[in-house]
Amino acid sequence: PEPPTACREKQYLINSQCCSLCQPGQKLVSDCTEFTETECLPCGESEFLDTWNRETHCHQHKYCDPNLGLRVQQKGTSETDTICTCEEGWHCTSEACESCVLHRSCSPGFGVKQIATGVSDTICEPCPVGFFSNVSSAFEKCHPWTSCETKDLVVQQAGTNKTDVVCGPQDRLRA
């Protein structure tokens, strides 16, 4: 028979032969031959390969360096890499999560639209009319101005995006 020019899924072509790829979690030790099947070996401790492959070396698991604010979110297996995330109050600087930075706080006049996670920073939004924030915070949303009317009071000082309204008693004197 003619030697193959293409192989089935999970195979690779070498020396005019279709050899089985090694399954995830294993590395190639020896290509198949006319006499033998592909020889594969499991990856060692702290190593992985996440695809059907013909790699002769497994990849090292990612190290979650605590000096960079990282911790293990999910321990790696022979088939998956370790997933790092950031310590409380910090978030990743990139999708690969190679280092962390402190969550941003929203300044007075801004409130938290979305609280930060291990992988995303705080999202702030300006407090709209009727709302305010008088603190720098990574958690606080914009608060609504106090409704003086519901307290049977009147506005003595208008609110801003940074301050609440000031309510006062109604003037009882009538002309």
């Epitope: 089985s20 030790v29 006499f35 099947e37 020889e39």
Partner: antibody, heavy 115, light 112 residues
Framework: QVQLVQSGAEVKKPGASVKLSCKAS????????IYWVKQAPGQCLEWIGG????????NFNEKFKSRATLTVDTSISTAYMELSRLRSEDTAVYYC????????WGQGTTLTVSS | DVVMTQSPLSLPVTLGQPASISCRSS???????????LHWYQQRPGQSPNHLIY???NRFSGVPDRFSGSGSGTDFTLKISRVEAEDVGVYFC?????????FGCGTKVEIK
């Protein structure tokens, strides 16, 4: 072209050891196992075992495991088989062989074990 | 161990005539990957073995097409369609499906 050149004939006394060599050329040595086969006069061929030069990993016929040692020296593309505690039944021609993209044999080494 | 039994032990043939050698294994040589690792080779007097066929029916490069292999499971055959003078020698079958790899004891092909 691929060549396997084996060491010369050996004559040994029972109980001694012998180390046979197989020098490879014409290909990347670490890419293919080297296997050893015994052909004794009037007997069937016997597979002794093989070694992967990439990592030194071996597989053996249990019959030979206790007395045969397979090694490689990748710096000189040479495989070795040491046979210990020799006895008269070890008298044979020993071949090294390689397969993958064709099968190649050494010319054989004749070992005679006699007192 | 897998026992490989060849027959006949000796095969006198006439030049230009066909020849057939049988090889039976004591267990199936079908590997879990779907391949059958049964091989044939020839050894001329005073020479190293020379492989003819691998995986039942695949001829090695340079092997004349008068040599063919067939069979499956435990029953295999090597055929020479028209024997030539250079075909004289001992023919072996071997299996590499199971460890240890094992060999038939050979069939001696000679000219009548």
């Amino acid at each position: 072209q691929v060549q396997l050149v084996q060491s010369g004939a050996e004559v040994k006394k029972p109980g001694a050891s012998v180390k046979l060599s197989c020098k490879a050329s014409g290909y990347t040595f670490i890419s293919y196992y080297i296997y050893w086969v015994k052909q004794a006069p009037g007997q069937c061929l016997e597979w002794i075992g093989g070694i992967n030069p990439r990592n030194g990993g071996t597989n053996f016929n249990e019959k030979f495991k206790s007395r045969a040692t397979l090694t490689v020296d990748t710096s000189i593309s040479t495989a070795y088989m040491e046979l210990s505690r020799l006895r008269s039944e070890d008298t044979a021609v020993y071949y090294c062989t390689r397969h993958g993209n064709g099968v190649y044999w050494g010319q054989g080494t004749t070992l005679t074990v006699s007192s | 161990d897998v026992v490989m039994t060849q027959s006949p032990l000796s095969l006198p043939v006439t030049l230009g005539q066909p020849a057939s050698i049988s090889c039976r294994s004591s267990q199936s040589l079908l590997h879990s990957n779907g391949n059958t690792y049964l091989h044939w080779y020839q050894q001329r007097p005073g020479q190293s073995p020379n492989h003819l066929i691998y995986q039942v029916s695949n001829r090695f490069s340079g092997v004349p097409d008068r040599f063919s292999g067939s069979g499956s499971g435990t029953d295999f055959t090597l055929k020479i369609s028209r024997v030539e003078a250079e075909d004289v020698g001992v023919y072996f079958c071997s299996q590499t499906t199971h460890v240890p790899w094992t060999f038939g004891c050979g069939t001696k092909v000679e000219i009548k």
